[in-house]
């Protein structure tokens, strides 16, 4: 008799795919255009990269430290109307994308959380999101929350009000803290909350470093979901040297919980890396007449146009890994394992019950390197097979589908491989 | 049960004032969030503003911002709807609604569960 299959575990949308942050309408939509009529003809866009759920914003009216002039119900003017948000819902929802609004207070100003007045701030959170999950949102962001005064007894009050509306809506808490401690004591009183922080930003980016991290983090929070960025709000490429970008997102897709990335990661937007570029929130790439004022500023191969059309970019890429990510039972809610691998590599399993299997093999190091996975640490339910297809590489030059042989296994420089294999009885 | 009587309506010159008055009585008031609502001859019922159970957040619609304020007085029980620069097309049956499972109300009327009769304005030109 065939054995019996393992029961499903409860999924959430938000645990079947990534989100997207859009934390400047104006800068994902280009110089100066940008609002929520606009962002609504970009939703192809979004649902292209397979993106579960769209956080935006903040949007609301908020005048620079000014209590008084800021409205959490009110949505800021430039950014468009309500009726404008209510109908962006609506094509969001037909695409099936989330929208999580960031009602973050003090957007504008210096402390994100008026530090004098919290109390009466902290109201008006409360209020806002009773207001706007009658608008149809599906969750919220709050962000710095390491700044707010007896944040986790806030943070419990709101997530009551997002499940209390409905066990489908999420909140999202933003820190820029790194500090493992600080995190779990945010995360033990809010029991479904996802947290961002800049945990994997304060990394030596070497494969035993990284390791450390991840498995320090997942034991710290138990069978907890988790997310996974390397900040609360900012780019990938703030964080990260160049060469690790395509090692990271494929690391950050294949992770036990749900990745966040912002606008622009899945094309490699780098702050500031443009005369005249804000730093905070760079122009997101369209083509290359995105940068209009300074002709041959912007490449192709920059640029969601040029990458689109380029199977090896990081974009392509971005878009594989999202598939894989929101349709592979191991990577959606598999069990997670790592084992012992060459120095400088990181490598891991997911599998769940009798589906397909996947390795992940990530080299961080400079240098080529021989795999040397030892499946010995693993165990029984996830040995190694001797062979696995390779559903994707980082680097250009392998041929998709080859069966490779796991004890001669080589790879590249900051070369991360993926790798698929069956379940055997 | 929530019961709501409105008060305040009547008569005036368009550019000029009115203050509606909606008494509850019933159900913890404090912990309701309240909005009023209005009904022209022909049409149907729309929002005019809410107001949260603390009362420090208010919410109004495009056609009535910056000339209505909406305020609530829980020691009293009751939310008070001022209309300044009142216009020929405010002229409609004002009615004052209670959100039991909100702090906060919405601007569609499915989420009050408790209505007043109403109480009729008429601006004339």
């Known amino acids: 008799r065939a054995p019996r299959c393992r029961e499903l575990p409860a999924q959430k949308w938000w645990h079947t795919g990534a989100l997207y942050r859009i934390g400047d309408l104006q800068a994902f939509q280009g110089h100066g255009s940008g609002n929520l009529a606009g962002l609504k003809g970009r939703l192809d866009y979004l649902s292209s990269l397979k993106v579960k759920g769209l956080v935006l914003g903040p949007l609301h009216k908020n005048q620079k430290d000014d209590v008084a002039q800021t409205d959490l119900l009110q949505i800021d003017p430039n950014f468009g109307s309500k009726e404008d948000f209510d109908n962006l819902l609506q094509s969001a929802k037909k695409k099936s994308i989330r929208v999580i609004l960031d009602l973050t207070p003090n957007y504008r100003g210096e402390n994100l959380w008026f530090s004098t007045q919290v109390d009466s701030v902290a109201t008006k959170v409360k209020d806002a999101l009773e207001f706007w999950l009658q608008a149809g949102v599906d969750g919220f962001q709050v962000r710095d929350i390491e700044n707010l005064k007896d944040a986790s007894s806030f943070l419990a009050e709101w997530e009551n009000i997002t499940k209390g509306f409905s066990e489908d809506r999420l909140l999202i808490a933003g820190t820029n803290s790194s500090d493992l401690q600080q995190i779990v004591s945010l995360l033990e009183s809010n029991k479904d909350l996802l947290l961002t922080s800049s945990y994997l930003s304060d990394s030596s980016f070497t494969g035993e470093h990284t390791k450390s991290l991840v498995t320090q983090y997942l034991n710290a929070t138990g069978n907890r979901w988790c997310s996974w960025s390397l900040s609360q709000a900012g780019l990938l490429t703030s964080f990260l040297p160049a060469q690790l970008l395509r090692l990271y997102q494929l690391m950050l897709f294949t992770l036990p919980g749900t990745p966040v990335f912002s606008y622009g990661d899945e094309i490699g937007l780098k702050a500031a890396a443009l005369p005249g570029q804000p730093v905070e929130a760079p122009v997101m790439l369209w083509d290359e007449s995105s940068f209009p004022d300074i002709p041959g500023a912007v490449s192709a191969n920059m640029t969601v146009k040029g990458q689109s059309e380029d199977p090896g970019s990081l974009l392509s890429l971005f878009r594989q890994l999202s598939d894989q990510r929101s349709k592979e039972r191991s990577l959606l809610h598999g069990d997670f394992h790592t084992f012992s691998s060459g120095p400088g590599l990181f490598s891991y399993i997911r599998h769940w019950d009798q589906n397909e299997r996947f390795l992940v093999v990530l080299n961080f190091g400079d240098v080529g390197l021989s795999a040397g996975l030892q499946a010995s640490d693993l165990p029984a339910s996830a040995s190694l097979p001797t062979k696995a297809d390779l559903v994707l590489s980082t680097q250009p030059g392998r041929e998709e589908g080859s069966p490779l042989e796991l004890e001669r296994l080589k790879l590249e420089p900051h070369e991360g491989l993926l790798l698929r294999f069956p379940y055997v009885a | 049960q929530v019961q709501l009587v409105e008060s305040g309506g009547g008569l005036v010159q368009a550019g000029g004032s009115l203050r509606l008055s909606c008494a509850a009585s019933?159900?913890?008031?404090?912990?309701?969030?309240m909005g009023w609502f209005r009904q022209a001859p022909g049409k149907e019922r729309e929002f005019v503003a809410t107001?949260?159970?603390?009362?420090?957040?208010?919410y109004y619609a495009d056609s009535v911002k910056g000339r209505f304020t909406i305020s609530r007085d829980n020691a009293k029980n009751t939310v008070y709807l001022q209309m300044n620069s009142l216009k020929p097309e405010d002229t409609a049956v004002y009615f004052c609604?209670?959100?039991?499972?909100?702090?906060?109300?919405?601007?569609?009327?499915?989420?009050?569960?408790?209505w007043g009769q109403g109480t009729q304005v008429t601006v004339s030109s």
């Open positions: 609604a209670a959100d039991t499972r909100h702090c906060m109300g919405y601007t569609k009327d499915e989420g009050y569960a408790y």
């Open positions: 107001i949260s159970c603390s009362g420090t957040s208010t």
């Open positions: 019933g159900r913890a008031f404090s912990s309701n969030g």
